[in-house]
Interface confidence: low
């Protein structure tokens, strides 16, 4: 039997479900009395799903898992993992008996996109061209571990005097804070682009300061 | 909690065979695998292969390769390992292991009593 | 095959020492290491898993570090329970292998 998963990541949503794709070819008159089939995680060895004896077994890991019943005899043991967390995050390996056996591993990878960057300033009033100002760009509830970058209202990338910080929560989402500290000129425009590196999602926001008032 | 029940010592003649069993109790027998161990006297530990039952299959050390067969009966929940062509260097004491609910296929949580193999003519 | 190298093979000691025994694997093996303990006429009993995993029930005593290639037990404090036999062994790939073993005994 030759087992065969998708070499590409597959790539889920937090809090949404996830199929990590397995399939084999059964020779004719396969019946799944035949079929031994275990879900297991890579790296520690840990059960996830197995199917075995002309039945599922059931899920081995947190009761989110499922196999698709249906679609098992066409050779298709791909699993459903429902409301995919952080945690799950990791390589799956997808083990199939019927006479002989094969194997072959695929990566989950969690993702979470980022909120729109709210922005602060420090001082936020009686600004004069040659203050030296703080922006603080924050964004929220993102997976993985987020890309940013400053620019100045030409675009042109500010990476001096750049402090990021970026801290998990309980469910092991980030929060941002990257912080910007620049002397005014007369006018001035700062964008913070927070960038996703697995969905490829940007979050803008900037600041233009004018004197007074400020744009958000 | 699982145990591990192995069948009772043996005395064998050089060439000949035994079959070791291993009753499993208490866990899902069908779902982890069951492993082999031996101990010669005096001596250190020496893995000899593995069956998951789940799948049917065993894996050996190379060593024992073409000399060593190792079983499952699921619906006894009984793991069997026989070895042939015996020699004095096979008399040992014979473990079968397991990672019980861990769901470890290679680590050893539960181990049988041990069976004492002796070969001698 | 992996080839596990304990050290010492023999360590004298006294109740209350501090003890650290070494495992050398020929490969890396990442942390894929377990260790046993083993008493006269006993079967062995698992006592850290992925090389620092104190496992369930045994003593806060017992503790494993290292990766790679370079493993060490430590037993903070020696207990009269402690002298035994201590086995290290690789999970990183078939076939499973251990160590040679090492025996603890009273100085």
């Known amino acids: 039997v030759e087992v065969q998963v998708s070499e590409d990541p597959v790539v889920a949503l937090v809090d949404t479900d996830a199929t990590l794709r397995c399939s084999f070819s059964p020779e004719p008159g396969f019946s799944l009395a035949q079929l031994n089939l275990i879900w297991q995680l890579t790296d520690t060895k840990q059960l996830v799903h197995s199917f075995t004896e002309g039945r599922d077994q059931g899920s081995a890991y947190s009761n989110r898992t499922a196999l698709f019943p249906d679609l098992l005899v066409q050779g298709n043991a791909s699993l459903r993992l429902q409301r995919v967390r952080v945690t799950d995050e990791g390589s799956y390996t997808c083990f199939v008996s019927i006479q002989d056996f094969d194997s072959a591993a695929v990566s989950l990878q969690v993702a979470a996109p980022y909120s729109k960057p709210s922005m602060t300033l420090e001082p936020n009033k009686d600004l004069r061209p040659g203050n030296m100002v703080t922006i603080t760009c924050s964004s929220y509830q993102g997976y993985p571990e987020a890309e940013v970058f400053w620019k100045d209202g030409q675009g042109v990338p500010l990476t001096g005097n750049v402090t990021t910080s970026q801290m998990a929560n309980e469910r092991g989402l980030f929060d941002v804070h990257s912080v910007l500290r620049v002397v005014l000129g007369a006018n001035g425009t700062y964008s913070c682009l927070v960038r996703n590196p697995v969905l490829q999602q940007d979050a803008h926001g900037s600041v233009t300061i004018t004197g007074q008032p400020l744009t958000f | 909690q699982v145990q591990l029940v192995e069948s009772g010592a043996e005395v064998k003649k050089p060439g000949s065979s035994v079959k070791v069993s291993c009753k499993a109790s208490?866990?899902?027998?069908?779902?982890?695998?069951i492993s082999w161990v031996r101990q010669a006297p005096g001596q250190g530990l020496e893995w000899m292969g593995r069956?998951?039952?789940?799948?049917?299959?065993?894996n050996y050390a190379q060593k024992f390769q073409g000399r060593v067969t190792i079983t499952a009966d699921k619906s006894t929940s009984t793991a069997y390992m026989e070895l042939s062509s015996l020699r004095s260097e096979d008399t040992a004491v014979y473990y079968c292991?397991?990672?019980?609910?861990?769901?470890?296929?290679?680590?050893?949580?539960?181990w049988g009593q041990g069976t004492l193999i002796t070969v001698s003519s | 095959d992996i080839q596990m190298t304990q050290s010492p093979s023999t360590l004298s000691a006294s109740v209350g020492d501090r003890v650290t025994i070494t495992c050398r694997a020929s490969?890396?093996?990442?942390?894929?290491l377990a260790w046993y303990q083993q008493k006269p006429g006993k079967a062995p009993k698992l006592l850290i898993y992925?090389?620092?995993s104190l496992q369930s029930g045994v003593p806060s005593r017992f503790s494993g570090s290292g990766s790679g290639t370079e493993f060490t037990l430590t037993i903070s404090s020696l207990q009269p329970d402690d002298f035994a036999s201590y086995y290290c062994?690789?999970?990183?790939?078939?076939?499973?292998?251990f160590g040679g073993g090492t025996k603890v005994e009273i100085k």
């Open positions: 292991a397991n990672g019980g609910d861990s769901s470890s296929w290679y680590t050893f949580d539960y």
């Open positions: 208490g866990g899902t027998f069908s779902s982890y695998a």
């Open positions: 069956i998951i039952p789940i799948l049917g299959i065993a």
């Open positions: 490969q890396s093996i990442d942390n894929w």
């Open positions: 992925k090389a620092s």
């Open positions: 062994q690789q999970y990183d790939s078939n076939p499973l292998t």
